[in-house]
């Protein structure tokens, strides 16, 4: 028998730097968790005391924090080389800044291969981008060799801006035959590498004969054997054991997100390549496990570039942003129309002509806005005051709802209304009107949403078996601030860019603006 | 295939400059950084810099940073190194090599550059 | 500067033999070591990188190990093509070649 080790982190978002048990920011440095410092720790820790070891990453490490806005993907790629990366995925936000932007800091500057078997380049970025992703990679480990096939969501045209002349194809229909080329160069031991979510992990361990480990991203997916060391509570056991169709138990696993994890998985394999056990569970990286002096110390280097960007303007107004607790719990605040206005922007993927946007819907509940910025500053707009207004790190996600769930939410927003509660809805492409003299449930006296099958947008009445696509923060999708209908009722979730930095590309595009409240939400005549 | 086109030999004068090329083809020229190598007749290769095509970013060893200066013709897939002040000490074959995964992969044949009175 | 101490700087070896050859470094490279193979009058040729990975159409004979600060380039049975000079590069922190071993046949 033969013993590999696999370690493995997914949807990291940037948090190269350690942070709270949440992954906001390293607020009490005694209970700050991850970080790329702290995770050389670990692996190496691991690498010394193991044979035959592979660290892995099943993509999303672009996009989350400042580091990301400032440094574009050098960050990763500088780090991703100090920790000594095996091989990584790629995940649907490496495309966030276009074909290039993964090129250029990622691609061109990884000492370790980048994998994807289902993302097929056509046109002139075939030969452009020829040979610097893959299929897949054949690792020599010890003695032996593994096989790394990598894959990505389908999805990525919808969630990423990946441009035109990238196919992406179903990851099955991709795969099997990368795992039968692989099986006659002799390769017996294959990992598929991915990121599509959780349920697309257990239908590839099912579906790709060959396949012996997948190792996942994209849904955030905790996974643990036992009692969990943290908050965070385990969708099943680690590893996830599927039955595959040609009857073998294929480990699943994945490691929920943020680098607040190690994945650790041991496999043991017989001389034919077959798995013969797998155990092993998430290390969680907390403060026990000390950073890495010398990468913490690279950490501080590359660190004093953000500071001096958090003070540089990014763009003016020339109205103030009123994103009072006053207004935005209450009515409709030029902040809020602002922050959606800029959540759909970044959502514009022409993918159909039948449609002029795949989304045109967005919801923020008013108490995730933390603060108004004053015009009377010049007009300045900088990344620090933005970071006041939306302070939790969250991201702006994609989901999928049926009309019937949209119109609970809606109640959800007044259902007590005039507390002063973080649940009033500010939107972008919604148009609805209360009845607050009307029991609470029944208040929402009209709701218009603006079409996306058209070629000139125009606002119809909601459609309660109709699924519409929404942009809304990851704490709603979450259920935060009540709306639990949202998290049970929702038909697909796809988490998106991190909020501040969708805002602040907005205002710098946009350059100058100038937001007004416009009669988004209103209040029949004599109830308010 | 891949292939670093370098011409065989170059004769330059003491005090001169001279302009060495490396034509690449079968793949994109700006999706990969290029690497310059020198070798001194019967002795081990030594690292001189690299560019990446399509920023025109340098990376140089120290001790050559005032001697190479590197460039690239985009519109030709044309790598370039000019040396200067030439003497008898940068006499040898130079090398362009492309870069992948942080090291070297594919070869240019080198050109011989003598420094001769 | 990272230096990279290769040995021997010569040898002889008869065919069908195991051959190593040895790097080491002057600090922890991180298994970023490359080896290359040049013939007289040739450009040089890559054979492994990330200290054990093969470059494609690489006879299986050759193989690389090592971590931290020492590697080796072994030729599990030597054949006469193999004769040549082998060298290794660092690439962690910019690059460093070795010295260079000069492999003959007995």
């Known amino acids: 028998a033969w013993e590999l080790t696999i370690l493995h982190t997914n949807d990291v978002h940037s948090r190269l730097e350690q942070t709270s048990e949440d992954s906001s920011k390293c607020v009490n440095a005694s209970r700050c968790m991850g970080g790329v410092a702290r995770l050389f720790t670990k692996v190496q820790q691991i690498r010394r005391a193991e044979p035959n070891v592979l660290l892995l990453d099943a993509g999303d490490q672009y996009q989350g924090t400042i580091w990301f806005t400032v440094y574009k993907g050098a960050e990763v790629a500088h780090f991703m080389n100090a920790l000594r990366y095996d091989a990584m995925a790629l995940g649907n936000h490496e495309f966030d800044n276009g074909v290039e932007g993964l090129i250029e800091p990622l691609l061109k500057e990884a000492k370790f291969p980048i994998l994807s078997a289902n993302i097929k380049a056509k046109g002139p970025l075939a030969s452009q981008i020829s040979g610097l992703y893959l299929p897949y990679k054949v690792l020599p480990v010890g003695d032996e060799v593994v096989g790394i096939v990598g894959y990505t969501s389908k999805e990525t045209p919808f969630l990423s801006n990946p441009g035109t002349n990238l196919v992406f194809e179903d990851e099955i229909t991709a795969l099997q035959p990368e795992v039968d080329k692989l099986k006659t160069l002799n390769v017996n031991k294959i990992i598929a590498l991915g990121h599509s979510g959780f349920e697309m992990d257990k239908l590839i361990a099912q579906k790709v004969r060959g396949v012996d480990v997948v190792v996942g991203g994209h849904s955030n997916t905790f996974l643990y054997t036992g009692n969990p060391p943290s908050k965070e509570v385990p969708a099943g056991k680690y590893p996830f054991i599927v039955t595959s169709d040609d009857g073998r138990k294929v480990p699943v696993v994945q490691a929920y997100a943020f680098g607040k994890y190690l994945g650790y998985l041991k496999i043991e394999f017989d001389e034919r390549g077959n798995v013969i056990s797998s155990h092993g569970n998430p290390i969680l990286l907390n403060s026990s496990i000390p950073e890495d002096p010398s990468i913490k110390a690279d950490i501080n280097k590359w660190r004093i570039k953000l500071d001096n960007y958090s003070t540089q303007e990014l763009g003016k107004t020339i109205v103030y942003l009123d994103g009072s607790s006053q207004s935005c719990r209450f009515r409709e605040c030029n902040m809020g129309n602002l922050i959606c206005d800029a959540m759909i922007n970044n959502n514009l993927r022409h993918t159909d002509e039948m449609f002029w946007n795949h989304v045109s819907m967005c919801i923020l509940n008013g108490g995730g806005i933390r603060s108004p910025i004053d015009e009377r500053n010049n007009g300045t707009i900088t990344w620090e005051n933005l970071a006041a207004v939306l302070p939790f790190g969250g991201t702006f996600d994609l989901v999928q709802l049926k009309g019937s769930t949209l119109k609970k939410a809606f109640e959800h927003s007044v259902h007590r209304y005039g507390q002063s509660t973080g649940e009033f809805l500010q939107v972008g492409g919604i148009h609805v009107v209360y009845d607050l003299s009307r029991k609470p449930g029944d208040r929402v006296v009209k709701l218009d949403v603006l079409c996306t099958k058209c070629r000139v947008p125009s606002y119809d009445p909601l459609k309660m078996d109709e699924v519409y696509k929404v942009i809304l923060p990851n704490f709603l999708a979450n259920g935060g601030d009540g709306f639990q209908m949202i998290k049970d009722e929702l038909l697909r979730h796809d988490s998106g860019d991190q909020d501040i930095n969708v805002v602040s590309t907005y205002i710098s595009k946009m350059k100058v603006i100038y937001p007004a409240v416009e009669g988004r939400i209103k209040f029949s005549t004599g109830s308010h | 295939q891949v292939q670093l086109q370098q011409p065989g030999a170059e004769l330059v004068k003491p005090g001169a400059s001279v302009k060495l090329s490396c034509k690449a083809s079968?793949?994109?020229?700006?999706?990969?950084?290029m690497h310059w190598v020198k070798q001194r007749p019967g002795q081990g290769l030594e690292w001189i810099g690299e560019?990446?095509?399509?920023?025109?970013?340098?990376n140089y060893n120290e001790k050559f940073k005032s001697k190479a200066t590197l460039t690239v013709d985009k519109s030709s897939s044309t790598a370039f190194m000019q040396l200067s002040s030439l003497t008898s000490e940068d006499s040898a074959v130079y090398y362009c090599?492309?870069?992948?995964?942080?090291?070297?992969?594919?070869w240019g044949q080198g050109t011989s550059v003598t420094v001769s009175s | 500067d990272i230096k990279m101490t290769q040995s021997p700087s010569s040898m002889y070896a008869s065919l069908g033999e195991r051959v190593t050859i040895t790097c080491k470094a002057s600090?922890?490279?991180?298994?970023?070591l490359s080896w290359f193979q040049q013939k007289p009058g040739k450009s040089p040729k890559t054979l492994i990188y990330?200290?054990?990975i093969w470059v494609d159409g690489v006879p299986s004979r050759f193989s690389g190990s090592g971590s931290g600060q020492d590697y080796s380039l072994t030729i599990s049975s030597l054949e006469y093509e193999d004769m040549g000079i082998y060298y290794c590069?660092?690439?962690?922190?910019?690059?460093?070649f070795g010295g260079g071993t000069k492999l003959e046949i007995k």
């Open positions: 590069l660092q690439y962690d922190e910019l690059y460093t």
């Open positions: 600090q922890d490279i991180n298994s970023y």
């Open positions: 079968g793949y994109t020229f700006t999706s990969y950084w």
């Open positions: 090599a492309r870069r992948v995964y942080g090291t070297m992969d594919y």
């Open positions: 990330r200290a054990n």
């Open positions: 560019i990446n095509p399509s920023i025109g970013r340098t």
